[in-house]
């Protein structure tokens, strides 16, 4: 949107039963007019739960939301509710777009004129435009990760941002890999963090009227080797109808390169277990974590034979982890019965101690898992 344009959703239309959700960015000083319904039959506008009065700088009137000149405090969520049913007809979030107002050092220091349309906006000290993006104050990240701090702000004239580390000006010149500063995004990025990056990072945002600052704390966690961690509850017990498709999901977390196998427990000569007590299994899928979709097992057009226990086995150079789930396959006529029956929950998690290398892990299957 150019700053000279008026923000307008659409000409006033009869209320739609489908909820309309929009986010609009508006320049400071810009007029806003949003329509919801037609004239007297239009809905009522609310901001943050309070109904807007029909008069004033910001008003809800005859189905219209009208803001004479958009100010920072006007940012937020606006709802238009149908008069009788209170159905949400419009759900609009207005956010500040400060990119449309840029400072010019030659201008009157007491005010700011937008070069695109001649509007004069009052001076304003810096303020945070997206405080929700600054809620995470403490960043505790593993070594080698990327870290991003941001302090999105606005003001008039447009403020500048600079960064401090532990109270000292920070330009990243002593940091291996340097830093990335994006002033338009009000962000500082450090890639491949190391323990020496720990500290307090301060963004300092200032203009001629005032300044604001915010502190972030960075802790860099040195990696400790461990066998793969599998997300609890996955794979999940699943009930499916004959002929349907099934997806079993296994989420694996591992610093060391993990390898994943999907196994189906089978019966051999009437037995599910070998003489050594380990189950008989069939390997359905195997790959490393970088392979697309290895963490998902797809079973297409399932039949009664597909029912049974499935295991996600993940191993790395430190050890093995695995979790199992049951697939129940019902004939189509049992579909209604399934919907009314609570699903029994069973997740088996066994952990092996393994000191041998990665190749030995899956070689060990010959001992621990019978195929």
């Amino acid at each position: 949107l150019e700053a000279s344009e008026e923000v307008e959703l659409e000409p006033c239309l009869a209320p739609s039963m489908e909820q309309q959700e929009q986010e609009l960015t508006v320049a400071l000083g810009q007029p806003v007019r949003l329509c919801c319904g037609r004239a007297e039959r239009g809905g009522h506008w609310y901001k943050e739960g309070s109904r807007l009065a029909p008069a004033g700088r910001v008003r809800g009137w005859r189905g219209r939301l009208e803001i004479a000149s958009f100010l920072p405090e006007d940012a937020g969520r606006y709802l238009c509710l149908a008069r009788a049913s209170m159905i949400v007809l419009q759900n609009v979030t207005l956010t500040i777009d400060d990119s449309l107002t840029s400072s010019n050092d030659d201008e009157d220091p007491q005010s700011h004129r937008d070069s695109s349309n001649g509007h004069i906006y009052p001076q304003q000290a810096p303020y945070w435009t997206h405080p929700q993006r600054m809620e995470k104050k403490l960043h505790a990240v593993p070594a080698g990760n990327t870290v991003k701090f941001r302090c999105p702000a606005a003001g008039n004239p447009t403020p500048t941002i600079r960064w401090l580390k532990d109270g000292q000006a920070f330009h990243g010149e002593n940091r291996i890999g340097g830093i990335r500063l994006r002033h338009q995004h009000w962000s500082l990025v450090m890639e491949s963090v190391v323990p020496s990056d720990r500290g307090t990072y301060t963004c300092l945002v200032e203009n001629a009227v005032g300044s604001i600052r915010y502190n972030y704390l960075l802790d860099v966690l040195e990696r400790s080797p461990h066998r793969p961690i599998l997300q609890a509850g996955l794979p999940a017990n699943t009930t499916a109808v004959v002929g349907s498709d099934v997806e079993l999901l296994c989420k694996v977390y591992s610093d060391a390169q993990p390898h994943i196998q999907w196994l189906k427990h089978i019966v051999i000569n009437g037995s599910s277990f070998g003489a050594d007590g380990f189950p008989y299994v069939q390997v359905l899928k195997t790959a490393d974590i970088n392979s697309s979709e290895v963490e998902v097992l797809y079973l297409r057009n399932v039949s009664a034979e597909d029912a049974g226990e499935y295991t996600c086995l993940a191993g790395n150079s430190i050890g093995l982890s695995y979790q199992s789930a049951w697939l129940t396959v019902l004939p189509e006529e049992d579909l209604t019965w399934t919907a009314a029956t609570p699903e029994a929950r069973y997740t088996d998690k066994l952990e092996f101690r393994h000191d041998s290398g990665l190749n030995d892990i899956f070689e060990a299957q010959k001992i621990e898992w019978h195929e």
Partner: antibody, heavy 119, light 107 residues
Framework: QVQLLESGGGLVQPGGSLRLSCAAS????????MSWVRQAPGKGLEWVSV????????HYADSVKGRFTISRDNSKNTLYLQMNSLRAEDTAVYYC????????????WGQGTLVTVSS | DIQMTQSPSSLSASVGDRVTITCRAS??????LNWYQQKPGKAPKLLIY???NLQSGVPSRFSGSGSGTDFTLTISSLQPEDFAVYYC?????????FGQGTKVEIK
């Protein structure tokens, strides 16, 4: 309305050079960061490079670092991508895209221009 | 660089189905994730930005959720015009990597 129009694509031999342009209209060009994104035939999207609205910040994908240069001329509302030492794997449709304010979401895209690197 | 992994790589669905596509980042990327739709021979179109914000003009049947490493794009009731390829893209790190794409086909 916002429009982005790429040009400059074509057939070039390996090791050759090409300069892509992206003419922008319908918005205040200098207020927005711009990116190049490419797509090899039958493949997915690959981000190539970004430049801040005032040209103060640039960044490149590892695959093109040292060979490609992104630049802009705000007086002409034009974004450029200078591509040197071209390789067969650079064959793709190249899109220019505008970044949303405060975010790095590409809210407007050009129609793309095809670059073919072949002997 | 931060890797983005989408699943599934393709899926078949019918008009009216609820469709879910997932995207996983190789590290925490906060909510710095966008979703795009691309139809053959066309440029991509922004659907969702910053994980959960619906881009202006995009139908409300599209929604996004997630933060950290795991993200989801949901189409609540698939329409004929929704058959396309969908991509996630992270913008937490300076190199804005895309997922490999998910093709949504007609069953």
């Amino acid at each position: 309305q916002v429009q982005l129009l790429e040009s400059g694509g074509g057939l070039v031999q390996p090791g050759g050079s090409l300069r892509l342009s992206c003419a922008a209209s319908g918005f205040t060009f200098s207020d927005y960061a711009m990116s190049w994104v490419r797509q090899a035939p039958g493949k997915g999207l690959e981000w190539v490079s970004v430049i801040e609205g005032d040209g103060s910040y640039t960044h490149y994908a590892d695959s093109v670092k040292g060979r490609f240069t992104i630049s802009r001329d705000n007086s002409k509302n034009t974004l450029y991508l200078q591509m040197n030492s071209l390789r067969a794997e650079d064959t793709a449709v190249y899109y220019c895209a505008r970044e949303k304010t405060y975010s790095s979401a590409f809210d407007y895209w050009g129609q793309g221009t095809l670059v073919t690197v072949s002997s | 660089d931060i890797q983005m992994t989408q699943s599934p790589s393709s899926l078949s669905a019918s008009v009216g189905d609820r469709v879910t596509i997932t995207c996983r980042a190789s590290q925490d990327i906060s909510s710095d994730l966008n979703w795009y739709q691309q139809k053959p021979g066309k440029a991509p179109k922004l659907l969702i930005y910053d994980a959960s914000n619906l881009q202006s003009g995009v139908p409300s049947r599209f929604s996004g959720s997630g933060s950290g490493t795991d993200f989801t794009l949901t189409i609540s009731s698939l329409q004929p015009e929704d058959f396309a390829v969908y991509y996630c893209q992270q913008h937490y790190s300076p190199s804005h990597t895309f997922g490999q794409g998910t093709k949504v086909e007609i069953k």
